[in-house]
Every structure is written in structure tokens, then in C-alpha cells.
């Protein structure tokens, strides 16, 4: 997990989230996303 402080004076928390592809489809392997401020953006 990484934490970045911006000039605006507040902190934005970035967290890598990993899901298994087979939970959402038929593929295997892992899906990696990025959560910023509570929202998964990638």
C-alpha cells in the first residue's frame, strides 16, 4: 500500500487490489486494480 501527500494538504490513499479472474469469468489468473479514495479505477 502506498500513501501520497499532495500540496492541497489532504492525503490520497492508493491501494492495489487483486481479484481472481475466474470469479468474474472463465479465465484464470489474477486481475490487478488500483483503488483511490475508495474507488477502484483500474
Amino acid at each position: 500500500d502506498a500513501e501520497f501527500r499532495h500540496d492541497s494538504g489532504y492525503e490520497v490513499h492508493h491501494q492495489k487490489l487483486v481479484f481472481f479472474a475466474e470469479d468474474v469469468g472463465s479465465n484464470k489468473g489474477a486481475i490487478i486494480g488500483l483503488m483511490v479514495g475508495g474507488v477502484v479505477i483500474a
Epitope: Q15, L17, F19, F20, E22, K28
Partner: nanobody
């Protein structure tokens, strides 16, 4: 939820190997992605590895990639963690945990069932 019981911990020399086992009770075992976490003395609990419900997919923390192997046997309701090339920094209590499908498998909050842990000490 499932009940989880770890075994296989112990004292091992640097460079050695251990195999941890996690026995699960409950008929819904194959509904859960399974993970291993560890907690070193004075530190937080950290993700180690996870295996998908089918056992086909796995994911590892960078610190153990290439040294540890996670697997599962759904016919025995058991998850394994084969640990090779152990280092002193691998010393920790190792916990088995279960996460329901569709949740992020690398974060602690996804896991709602936990074992009591088994201690692994790597020292000469």
C-alpha cells in the same frame, strides 16, 4: 463460514523448507478463495499467497514469489503452503484464511474466516 486449523510450523534453518497445511471444516470449502497471511513479532499481518476456488489460479506477495507455493485439495478440504529457501525474515505466525468469491484476495478485510496460526521460526 468455515473453521480453519493450521499445522506444520516449526523451527528450520535458513535455506530449509517447511510445508504448512490448513484443514477446513464445512461443506462450502470450494466456495472460498483461500489465502495465507503472516505476522512477524511487532509487525502487522501481511498477505503471503492466495489460491482460487478451483486451485487453478494463484497469487503471491513479491517477498515470497519463487520460493513459496500455495495449493489446495478440494477433496480433502485442505490448503497447503510449501515454503522453500526460507530466510530469517520469514519468521512469523502464519495464518490460513478464507475469502468469499469476488473479493480482493490480497487484503486482510476480504477474509472472514481465520485459523489460529502456526509459528514458523527460521534461525540457525
Amino acid at each position: 463460514e468455515v473453521q480453519l486449523l493450521e499445522s506444520g510450523g516449526g523451527l528450520v534453518q535458513p535455506g530449509g523448507s517447511l510445508r504448512l497445511s490448513c484443514a477446513a471444516s464445512g461443506r462450502t470449502f470450494n466456495n472460498y478463495n483461500m489465502g495465507w497471511f503472516r505476522q512477524a513479532p511487532g509487525k502487522g499481518r501481511e498477505f503471503v499467497a492466495a489460491v482460487s476456488r478451483s486451485g487453478v489460479s494463484t497469487y503471491y506477495a513479491d517477498s515470497v514469489k519463487g520460493r513459496f507455493t500455495i495449493s489446495r485439495d478440494n477433496s480433502k478440504n485442505t490448503v497447503y503452503l510449501q515454503m522453500n529457501s526460507l530466510r530469517p525474515e520469514d519468521t512469523a505466525v502464519y495464518y490460513c484464511a478464507a475469502a468469499y468469491r469476488g473479493t480482493a484476495i490480497n487484503v486482510r478485510r476480504s477474509y472472514d474466516s481465520w485459523g489460529q496460526g502456526t509459528l514458523v521460526t527460521v534461525s540457525s
